[in-house]
């Protein structure tokens, strides 16, 4: 699997999409996990509804939400109020039994807000009580990581 890079701005929302073959993965729940190290396990962050037929319903864990268009074959993950610690490698997964097939490998990059919002007193930040539906979603910038490309080039 190639890695697809999704870039979002700190404090805003980032939408990650993972397309898949809807027939190949018919009946299978999906999950979003965070890769712990290069060879480490992928730690489950959130998964779709326990009943596959209700996969279209949004499920959330903290600031991360997931929804699955099982007919169209697109899994969508929304990371709300993006923070620097959200940067890293993730996977979209298709679950069957206790096994998980990787649908897409994702690198999330968090960009500093070009406008220094932290100094603005009148900035609205979605609170924990706000729903994901209300959150403003920035269209993410995504690209595929080229083979052999270093995601975070060392600074000299």
């Amino acid at each position: 699997h190639n890695t697809t890079v999704f870039q979002g701005v700190e404090g805003q929302s980032l939408q990650v999409s993972c397309p898949y073959d809807s027939m190949k993965h018919w009946g299978r729940r999906k999950a979003w996990c965070r890769q712990l190290g290069e060879k480490g396990p992928c730690q489950r962050v959130v998964s779709t509804h326990n009943l596959w037929l209700l996969s279209f319903l949004r499920r959330r864990n903290g600031s991360t939400a997931i929804t699955d268009d099982t007919l169209g074959g697109t899994l969508t993950i929304t990371l709300r109020n993006l923070q620097p610690h959200d940067a890293g490698f993730y996977q979209c997964q298709s679950l069957h039994g206790s096994e998980a097939d990787t649908l897409r490998k994702v690198l999330v990059e968090v960009l500093a807000d070009p406008l220094d919002h932290r100094d603005a007193g009148d900035l609205w930040v979605p609170g924990e009580s706000e729903s994901f539906e209300d959150a403003h979603v920035e269209h993410s910038i995504s690209r595929s990581l080229l083979e052999g490309e270093i995601p975070f080039p060392p600074t000299s």
Partner: antibody, heavy 123, light 107 residues
């Protein structure tokens, strides 16, 4: 009616190659995984591997990896199991089976089976 | 690999009897288990999936139960056509593995 029809019995000598087939009908062949299962004489069932004919994604049991090749030709709705060099220990009945995912528990089981192909390897 | 162990290996019973076959997994497999029936010279037939769900067309005298590591297949009232070999199979992880089989014979 869903059907998996397998090729006929084969008698081969050790070292020979062989390719057996499993033709699906009565359903969308490219939309279901197909598994191959071995049953040695008087013994139990052994899962060999699986293929998704839609894109030829294949998984093998470690016990059979490198021993056999699983392939499919979606244009003729047929899955294959092949050996490049048979051994006497390959003598067995080989079944193909359609794997169906049941959305109740997001796992998969074998709901339709072929009639089996008996392979006999003897010098 | 997950080992599946069935007991007994064979059982003799009469028409009308209630028969229970057990299957134990070497590690927890939730409810990801199937039961198949196989008659001599024939392909296996799916009876039960997800440990307790009856496959379409299978008589209601067949039932399955259990989760984790211990599972049972019960035939409430044996019919002549039920004499066959029964296999359990885990659908938890690759490679898929089957029990060694339980042969159900006429007493």
């Amino acid at each position: 009616e869903v059907q998996l029809v397998q090729s006929g019995a084969e008698v081969k000598k050790p070292g020979e190659s062989l390719k057996i087939s499993c033709k699906g009908s009565g359903y969308s062949f490219t939309s279901y995984w197909i598994a191959w299962v071995r049953q040695m004489p008087g013994k139990g069932l052994e899962w060999m591997g699986i293929i998704y004919p839609g894109d030829s994604d294949t998984r093998y049991s470690p016990s059979f990896q490198g021993q056999v090749t699983i392939s499919a030709d979606k244009s003729i709705s047929t899955a294959y199991l092949q050996w490049s060099s048979l051994k006497a220990s390959d003598t067995a009945m080989y079944f193909c089976a359609r794997q169906r995912t049941f959305y109740y528990d997001s796992s998969d089981y074998f709901d339709y089976w072929g009639q089996g192909t008996l392979v006999t390897v003897s010098s | 690999d997950i080992q599946m162990t069935q007991s007994p290996s064979s059982v003799s019973a009469s028409v009308g009897d209630r028969v229970t076959i057990t299957c134990r997994a070497s590690q927890g497999i939730s409810s990801w288990l199937a039961w198949y029936q196989q008659k001599p010279g024939k392909a296996p037939k799916l009876l039960i999936y997800a440990a307790s769900s009856l496959q379409n067309g299978v008589p209601s005298r067949f039932s399955g139960s259990g989760s984790g590591t211990d599972f049972t297949l019960t035939i409430s009232s044996l019919q002549p056509e039920d004499f066959a070999t029964y296999f359990c199979q885990q659908a938890d992880s690759f490679p898929r593995t089957f029990g060694q089989g339980t042969k159900l014979e006429i007493k």
